[in-house]
């Protein structure tokens, strides 16, 4: 039994890191393998992650971690029984994929303005709380070409757009994702989408 693709890990910079790797043949990850991990820290202890299958030869492990700080470094040991298959390390701050924003809501009762709000996925004491920027994706269910992205580069988790920038009388969906420039993160997954019917009063034409 050998490792074909070494484990690569990504952290949510809060409490979970996800490591994926591939073996050289079909493997029952949960019965044959164990990923041991430990924070390099005087008061830390070793933890064991039981991997799950991720395709025939692929394995994935979800590591429960202490709240992350930038200096953290974890040692990783991949075992098959008594055989050490791979040894490595992982700095969560260097491989961050933020959590997806939640609670996306579209407020349509503001005069001819759409207000989209969502929740920051981090608590206020987390470093990323004040460093996230967002991308909002709005698209029409009726017209695949009617697809737009709004970049929200300020900290407030909200976006205002004129209802008239969208077509009236049809349904739209929106979703939002996040990233943090400070740690050069990847984008988060998209939030669940929310749907609304766009309608607004056409202004009277002046003759």
């Amino acid at each position: 039994m050998k490792v074909l693709q070494e484990p690569t890990c990504v952290s949510d910079y809060m409490s979970i890191s996800t490591c994926e790797w591939k073996m050289n043949g079909p493997t029952n990850c949960s019965t044959e393998l164990r990923l041991l991990y430990q924070l390099v820290f005087l008061l830390s202890e070793a933890h064991t992650c039981i991997p799950e299958n991720n395709g025939g030869a692929g394995c994935v492990c979800h590591l429960l971690m202490d709240d992350v700080v930038s200096a953290d470094n974890y040692t990783l040991d991949l075992w098959a029984g008594q055989q050490l298959l791979w040894k490595g390390s992982f700095k969560p701050s260097e491989h961050v994929k933020p959590r997806a924003p939640g609670n996306l809501t579209v407020h349509t009762n503001v005069s001819d303005t759409l207000l989209l709000t969502w929740s920051n996925p981090y608590p206020p004491d987390n470093y990323l709380y004040n460093h996230l920027t967002y991308a909002v994706n709005i698209w029409s269910e009726n017209d695949p070409a009617d697809f737009r992205i709004y970049n929200v580069t300020y900290l407030e988790p909200s976006l205002r757009i004129a209802a008239s920038t969208l077509k009236s009388g049809i349904s739209y969906r929106a979703r939002v994702r996040a990233w943090a420039q400070c740690y050069n993160t990847t984008w988060s997954e998209w939030s669940p989408s929310t749907k609304w019917h766009n309608s607004y009063r056409e202004p009277f034409e002046q003759h």
Partner: antibody, heavy 115, light 109 residues
Framework: EVQLVESGGGLVHPGGSLRLSCAAS????????MFWVRQAPGKGLEWVSG???????SYADSVKGRFTISRDNAKNSLYLQMNSLRAEDTAVYYC?????????WGQGTLVTVSS | EIVLTQSPGTLSLSPGERATLSCRAS???????LAWYQQKPGQAPRLLIY???SRATGIPDRFSGSGSGTDFTLTISRLEPEDFAVYYC??????????FGQGTKVEIK
């Protein structure tokens, strides 16, 4: 908002015992190492003890064998059991949250050891 | 045990002046684990700098940290009235644990 509130300080005779408590709120207590740091009157800061999320502990040489740090994650509380107290243990005792450094501190509780 | 020695013991300066505080370690310290704190009378310490040079949340940019190995520096570019306080450096070591310097008092001249 992160809050750390110490209690249990007071006047104790040399050789006596005291138990300090620290009530934590505003963060996930169970995922954080916790510490006690003290400051004698007019003196500098001295790290006393720390406890990891899994219960691993460490102590300054000056308190080893006399002080015991513990935590109750269900109650979001940190404790310091201090036995065989000496005059030189007189200090303000701060509860702190952190790891390699301490971003969050309580306001401290005063322990006075005197006959 | 790693010993941190801060100098000077007291720094007498006027508002608007530049303050340079030194912290010297008895053996090499990882920059990732060197921090600076400010403490005012009757208050808990406040983290200013971590990782030798990163400002903590909410700390004004007049505070900066630098250094590596055994020599570290905290600089306050222009002293404001609220900056007069005691400053401590602190290090963490995987085997020795946590230690603080003895402090530098920045007082009004």
């Amino acid at each position: 908002e992160v809050q750390l509130v110490e209690s249990g300080g007071g006047l104790v005779h040399p050789g006596g015992s005291l138990r300090l408590s620290c009530a934590a709120s505003g963060f996930t207590f169970s995922r954080n190492a916790m510490f006690w740091v003290r400051q004698a009157p007019g003196k500098g800061l001295e790290w006393v003890s720390g406890i990891g999320t899994g219960g691993a502990t460490s102590y300054a040489d000056s308190v080893k064998g006399r002080f015991t740090i513990s935590r109750d994650n269900a109650k979001n509380s940190l404790y310091l059991q201090m036995n065989s107290l000496r005059a030189e243990d007189t200090a303000v005792y701060y509860c702190a949250r952190g790891r390699y450094y301490f971003p969050w501190w309580g306001q401290g509780t005063l322990v006075t050891v005197s006959s | 045990e790693i010993v941190l020695t801060q100098s000077p013991g007291t720094l007498s300066l006027s508002p608007g002046e530049r303050a340079t505080l030194s912290c010297r370690a008895s053996q090499s310290v990882s920059s990732s684990y060197l921090a600076w704190y400010q403490q005012k009378p009757g208050q808990a310490p406040r983290l200013l700098i971590y990782g030798a040079s990163s400002r903590a949340t909410g700390i004004p940019d007049r505070f900066s940290g630098s250094g590596s190995g055994t020599d570290f520096t905290l600089t306050i570019s222009r002293l404001e009235p609220e900056d007069f306080a005691v400053y401590y450096c602190q290090q963490y070591d995987h085997s020795a644990g946590w230690t603080f310097g003895q402090g530098t008092k920045v007082e009004i001249k």
